[in-house]
């Protein structure tokens, strides 16, 4: 009596259980009463990531540099290529199909939250006692240098964009 269901890694065809092709291989011909399933490895830049009966392998994803993308992990016959964004950009989705430019925080502002895979940079003004002298998508506000701990005195006050300038203490003659 012909089977109605097959074991794992098999499929039913013509009232017969045939072996699926392993990941990285595609189906060339179904098994018969006398022959095994015939499978063939995927070509260069192709993959199949499951036990399958596909007659065509999938093309590896293309990480388009014009969209700010680069290859993070090159695909194999069993896995797709993984794209990520170039430095200074972030993915527009978890799948990272395209990138957008990180917002930079201007001098006087620091990064409150660095851009994540799916959200842009969040900036905050540097409070009193802190400064940022660069336009950056990474740098937080830095605390002013403590002149006292270096046995120096403040010669020039700091701002939200500049550090304090320390100098030697006046010596009594």
């Amino acid at each position: 009596e012909p089977p109605t269901a097959c074991r794992e890694k098999q499929y039913l065809i013509n009232s017969q259980c045939c072996s699926l092709c392993q990941p990285g291989q595609k189906l060339v011909s179904d098994c018969t009463e006398f022959t095994e399933t015939e499978c063939l490895p995927c070509g260069e830049s192709e993959f199949l990531d499951t036990w399958n009966r596909e007659t065509h392998c999938h093309q590896h994803k293309y990480c388009d540099p014009n969209l700010g993308l680069r290859v993070q992990q090159k695909g194999t016959s069993e896995t797709d290529t993984i794209c990520t964004c170039e430095e200074g950009w972030h993915c527009t989705s978890e799948a990272c199909e395209s990138c957008v430019l990180h917002r930079s925080c201007s001098p006087g502002f620091g990064v409150k939250q660095i851009a994540t895979g799916v959200s842009d940079t969040i900036c905050e003004p540097c409070p009193v006692g802190f400064f940022s002298n660069v336009s950056s998508a990474f740098e937080k506000c830095h605390p002013w240098t403590s002149c006292e701990t270096k046995d120096l005195v403040v010669q020039q006050a700091g701002t939200n964009k500049t550090d304090v300038v320390c100098g030697p203490q006046d010596r009594l003659r």
Epitope: T79, T84, G117
Partner: antibody
Framework: QSVKESEGGLFKPTDTLTLTCTVS????????MIWVRQAPGNGLEWIGV???????YYATWAKSRSTITRNTNLNTVTLKMTSLTAADTATYFC???????????WGPGTLVTVSS | DIVMTQTPASVSAAVGGTVTIKCQAS??????LAWHQQKPGQPPKLLIY???TLASGVPSRFKGSGSRTEYTLTISDLECADAATYYC??????????????FGGGTEVVVK
């Protein structure tokens, strides 16, 4: 661009180790971060990796007692390892993982000693 | 488990000579491979990524080659400064795979 691990130190057997790695000069949302350790006189031993979507992969020996997390606000990656034994004595490194098109960045490492 | 097997464990060669280090992955890692150099008391230093791309500042005496499961690091015109331990590292991660150690066991290069 730099990566730096928090201070290690002396731990007792059964203690839990928590190490924090702080990155600066790059957005780690585009990179994978790894933890690696090296016992005295031994080779490099990979512990695990976290990717930009917070997916984690662990070495089979580390899976049951290691957790790697990221905090994008603080720009940090944390390794938590439970049930320490003397065999966990090593220098622990955090690194921005090398990938197919970009080089990695290693931290200087921090020494963790487990002894009763 | 994906296992990285590195050979030889140690190799010795004269200044000006050539050494070849091999790394075998237990499955196809698709050129997602790096080579690192480590000297005592220092963190590793990246030499090569993507199986054959030279990292910034690394001299062209270092050459990476190979594909799929077999990879090679060749150091030519050996210098005394090349004395170090060299490690291969798989940068290939897949939900369907597990990993014992993504690093090879290391090769100590002695320069005579």
């Amino acid at each position: 661009q730099s990566v730096k691990e928090s201070e290690g130190g002396l731990f007792k057997p059964t203690d839990t180790l928590t190490l924090t790695c702080t990155v600066s000069g790059f957005s780690f949302s585009n990179y994978r971060m790894i933890w690696v350790r090296q016992a005295p006189g031994n080779g490099l031993e990979w512990i695990g990796v976290i990717d930009r979507n917070d997916n984690t992969y662990y070495a089979t020996w580390a899976k049951s007692r290691s957790t790697i997390t990221r905090n994008t606000n603080l720009n940090t990656v944390t390794l938590k390892m439970t049930s320490l034994t003397a065999a966990d004595t090593a220098t622990y490194f955090c690194a921005r993982d090398t990938d197919y098109t970009t080089g990695g960045i290693w931290g200087p490492g921090t020494l963790v000693t487990v002894s009763s | 488990d994906i296992v990285m097997t590195q050979t030889p464990a140690s190799v010795s060669a004269a200044v000006g000579g050539t050494v070849t280090i091999k790394c075998q992955a237990s499955q196809n890692i698709g050129d997602n491979l790096a080579w690192h150099q480590q000297k005592p008391g220092q963190p590793p230093k990246l030499l090569i990524y993507g199986a054959s791309t030279l990292a910034s500042g690394v001299p062209s005496r270092f050459k990476g080659s190979g594909s799929r499961t077999e990879y090679t690091l060749t150091i030519s015109d050996l210098e005394c400064a090349d004395a170090a331990t060299y490690y291969c590292q798989s940068n290939y991660y897949s939900t369907s795979s597990s990993y014992y150690n993504s690093f090879g066991g290391g090769t100590e290069v002695v320069v005579k």
